[in-house]
Amino acid sequence: QLPPGKPEIFKCRSPNKETFTCWWRPGTDGGLPTNYSLTYHREGETLMHECPDYITGGPNSCHFGKQYTSMWRTYVMMVNATNQMGSSFSDELYVDVTYIVQPDPPLELTVEVKQPEDRKPYLWMKWSPPTLIDLKTGWFTLLYEIRLKPEKAAEWETHFAGQQTEFKILSLHPGQKYLVQVRCKPDHGYWSAWSPATFIQIPSDFIMND
């Protein structure tokens, strides 16, 4: 029977900069029941606080609701593991909520085959940013990535769209049914999950771009 091993806070995520959750990985339990507590302070403060919510994020997590979430202030947090034989502490983790946003996927992905008379045909797609993200304030710059593939293909073709919410693709295989998805990330955050796939049938007379 031993004191617990050193835990590690390995992940923090926020859906929208208004709330966030951090997760830790326990160290060895030393063969005894072990209690974990997360304490934190905000930079510039000395007062330590305990995690306000150990439930919402699931096991080994701490959730910070709206009233506990401040942007532009670094949180300094650590996890304490305690059993009957002693304690161990994680390294301190410095967290700025602005940098840990993982948005929901973009919405309303629509895909169309455009066949202008005077130019080569192309696949045109557009989408909307996720609703929880407020782009009007200027706090967010969202970047987008598109991927597509013929229905039966194994490999995806990926295109970086930058900040645009629409995109054109010229080189496609005629007669194929394509799956198209889009995802987004803040400039210093994490990629969302891919949006649900949208299917598009490419006409057999679609002229391949040279």
Epitope: F10, K11, C12, G44, T74, D91, L93, Y94, V95, Y190
Partner: antibody, heavy 120, light 107 residues
Framework: EVQLVQSGAEVKKPGSSVKVSCKAS????????MHWVRQAPGQGLEWIGE????????NYNQKFKDRATLTVDKSTSTAYMELSSLRSEDTAVYYC?????????????WGQGTLVTVSS | DIQMTQSPSSVSASVGDRVTITCKAS??????VAWYQQKPGKSPKLLIY???NRYTGVPSRFSDSGSGTDFTLTISSLQPEDFATYFC?????????FGGGTKVEIK
């Protein structure tokens, strides 16, 4: 204990490429951005670029955009910096440096440095 | 790019002295400034982040004041282990840039 261990010194010819490695241990590699910084002999520090090991998304100093390539191998917790079209003024100690937290770009852990000498 | 101008480039001081190093940003950087200490042949070591927050384990004799464009690193009572070169760094906008360094030497 957090450690960043870099590959050994290199001597390269002008026009060639060099690839420096940085093996991370003591923490979850995908949690923190990794940066690359260089220091010419007797000079100051110059930031080359940064990479997020969780998804390999990277940002570069425009000065190095066309010549530097940052990559990671998650399976071995190793970051790499490749610099191509080397010239004599690229002679420097190259450091990998881990982001201080989940936030802005200040650097709490540094590798021991790799001296790259470019000479004909 | 934001230029970070450090002064002086070197300073001679004795153990127990108060030493101040200044760093001037060419444009507004808020409090997005860090300070590092580097000894010969060694990697830099973080001292201060966000202009005024001491990193874990850094002695209280190191402090920073300033925001916007003007920053000052103060060593309140110089110790033998503090003889080194000090760099400021801004992380307000890409590319992240460093000052040219200030060497603190023994008088």
């Amino acid at each position: 204990e957090v450690q960043l261990v870099q590959s050994g010194a290199e001597v390269k010819k002008p026009g060639s490429s060099v690839k420096v490695s940085c093996k991370a241990s003591g923490y979850t590699f995908t949690t923190y951005w990794m940066h690359w910084v260089r220091q010419a002999p007797g000079q100051g520090l110059e930031w080359i670029g940064e990479i997020d090991p969780s998804d390999s998304y990277s940002n570069y100093n425009q000065k190095f955009k066309d010549r530097a390539t940052l990559t990671v191998d998650k399976s071995t917790s190793t970051a790499y910096m490749e610099l191509s079209s080397l010239r004599s003024e690229d002679t420097a100690v190259y450091y990998c440096a881990r982001n201080g937290g989940l936030g802005p770009a200040w650097f709490s852990y540094w590798g021991q440095g790799t001296l790259v000498t470019v000479s004909s | 790019d934001i230029q970070m101008t450090q002064s002086p480039s070197s300073v001679s001081a004795s153990v127990g002295d108060r030493v101040t190093i200044t760093c001037k940003a060419s444009q507004y950087v808020g409090t997005a400034v860090a300070w590092y200490q580097q000894k010969p042949g060694k990697s830099p070591k973080l001292l201060i982040y966000s202009a005024s927050n001491r990193y874990t384990g850094v002695p209280s004799r190191f402090s920073d004041s300033g925001s916007g464009t003007d920053f000052t690193l103060t060593i309140s009572s110089l110790q033998p282990e503090d003889f080194a070169t000090y760099f400021c760094q801004q992380y307000s906008s890409y590319p992240w840039t460093f000052g040219g360094g200030t060497k603190v030497e023994i008088k």
